[in-house]
């Protein structure tokens, strides 16, 4: 019986696991990984916290290790060039014999500390109208933002700051499915840039 | 403390079918497969296979197959036999057993099942 | 399919003495691991079996150590070395190696 597809997030240049989760590993004789192409076979070890990798593939040497009882698998070093669907393809001792897992695996970098760009849109009667700009450093997929504590989602925030607003903090937050990270601006240093004259202000 | 109790065993007549259920509290109950182990009167006792919790998947001993199916209701952490076409060589204990990956740790009490006319 | 034989089919002791019980298997049972899967149970009436060694002479926590287990291939001991009250009962050896999986037929330990 062939089983849903599982998604599976992993970090460039760390390691991640695919959840085989035998549980009977007394029954299995053999695991077949292929992706693009084979990847590796694993095999009952004497060691019952360890099975036996045989890796097929010279892009993923050094890199793979199973664990036991369940027989997870683990790619380490994590490349960009790993993502993709992997089939793992399970012979035991009993009818069915033969089942099949099937894993995507996407891969993303961990995000680094956002920045915050203003730009003044307009300033009237102790009121500036500001626009928040939030972005990480590399243009990343699958990446959301968030802003407190307006409860804002995407990257660009429009502020219509009044004097009382002062002691506000703005924080934005850049997520995506491995990591976070935020930043923060004060509402007390927006006013005072635009009382300035500064058009624009990068933080961190 | 890690318990199973089966239920569901009875009097039936020859060519009836009945439904056990195994309960198991105390653990997680999809990170470890059940099986089923039944034992007739005065006899030993007979590995009848097992089911995957985490993914419904069974394994029936080949003398148990075509009568006998396993299931699951991992909602209520219960594992079920449904026994058809009974016939009397079937009366016996029927014990659900919970395995640790290398042994089977914890059995349940049993249930009686009687097939008889 | 492996088939286990025990024997004796009954073993008539006196409390403090030594029971040796033997169960032999119809081919090898190490597995492709390397490992041998060999179990022995304990049945007393009308309760479930219980665990009580594992991959030939490990003791399941809890047993006492006047249990042990010895053996390799095919050929597999149960020893109690001092027999308690509460150790009369049926013993049956189980092979988890190679599937369909096999009990023994038991062997009872009785009060002489």
């Known amino acids: 019986k062939d089983s849903e597809i599982f998604t599976v997030n992993g970090i460039l240049g760390e390691s991640v696991t695919f959840p085989v989760n035998i549980q009977e590993p007394r029954q299995v004789k053999i695991i077949a990984w292929t992706s693009k192409t084979s990847v590796a076979y694993v095999t009952p070890g004497d060691s019952e916290t360890a099975p036996v990798v045989t890796v097929t593939h010279r892009n993923y040497y050094e890199r793979i290790h199973a664990l036991g009882p369940n027989y997870n698998l683990v790619i380490s070093d994590l490349r960009m060039e790993d993502a993709g669907d992997y089939k793992a393809d399970i012979n035991t001792q009993a009818d069915p014999y033969t089942t099949t897992k099937r894993y995507n695996l996407q891969i993303y970098r961990r995000l680094g500390k956002p920045k915050i760009t203003q730009s003044l849109m307009a300033s009237v009667n102790s009121t500036c109208n500001v626009t928040l700009t939030c972005s990480v450093e590399k243009e990343e997929k699958n990446v959301t933002y968030n802003w407190s504590p307006l409860g804002e989602e995407g990257n660009v925030l429009q502020i219509f700051q009044t004097p009382e607003d002062q002691e506000l903090t703005y924080t934005c937050t850049a997520q995506n499915p491995v990591s976070n990270n935020s930043d923060s601006i004060s509402a007390r240093q927006l006013c005072a840039d635009i009382a300035m004259g500064f058009r624009t202000h990068h933080t961190g | 403390e890690i318990q199973l109790v089966e239920s569901g065993g009875g009097l039936v007549k020859p060519g009836g079918s009945l439904r056990l259920s195994c309960a198991a509290s105390g653990y997680t109950f999809t990170t470890y497969s059940m099986h089923w182990v039944r034992q007739a009167p005065g006899k030993g006792l007979e590995w009848m296979g097992w089911?995957?919790?985490?993914?419904?998947?069974?394994t029936l001993a080949d003398d148990f197959k075509g009568r006998f199916t396993f299931s699951l209701d991992t909602s209520k952490n219960t594992a079920y036999l449904q026994m058809n076409s009974l016939k009397i060589e079937d009366t016996a204990v029927y014990f659900c057993?919970?395995?640790?990956?290398?042994?089977?740790?914890?059995w349940g009490k049993g249930t009686t099942v009687t097939v008889s006319s | 399919e492996v088939v286990m034989t025990q024997s004796p089919g009954t073993l008539s002791l006196s409390p403090g003495e030594r029971a040796t019980l033997s169960c032999r298997s119809s081919?090898?049972?190490?597995?492709?691991?390397?490992?041998?899967?060999l179990e022995w149970y304990q049945q007393k009436p009308g309760q479930a079996p219980r665990l009580l060694i594992y991959k030939v002479s490990n003791r399941f926590s809890g047993i006492p150590d006047r249990f042990s287990g010895s053996g390799s291939g095919t050929d597999f001991t149960l020893t109690i070395s001092r027999l308690e009250p509460e150790d009369f009962a049926v013993y049956y050896c189980?092979?988890?190696?190679?599937?369909?999986?096999?009990f023994g037929p038991g062997t009872k330990v009785d009060i002489k």
């Open positions: 089911i995957d919790t985490a993914t419904g998947e069974p």
């Open positions: 189980f092979q988890g190696s190679h599937v369909p999986w096999t």
């Open positions: 081919q090898s049972i190490v597995h492709i691991n390397g490992n041998t899967y």
């Open positions: 057993v919970k395995s640790a990956y290398w042994y089977f740790d914890v």
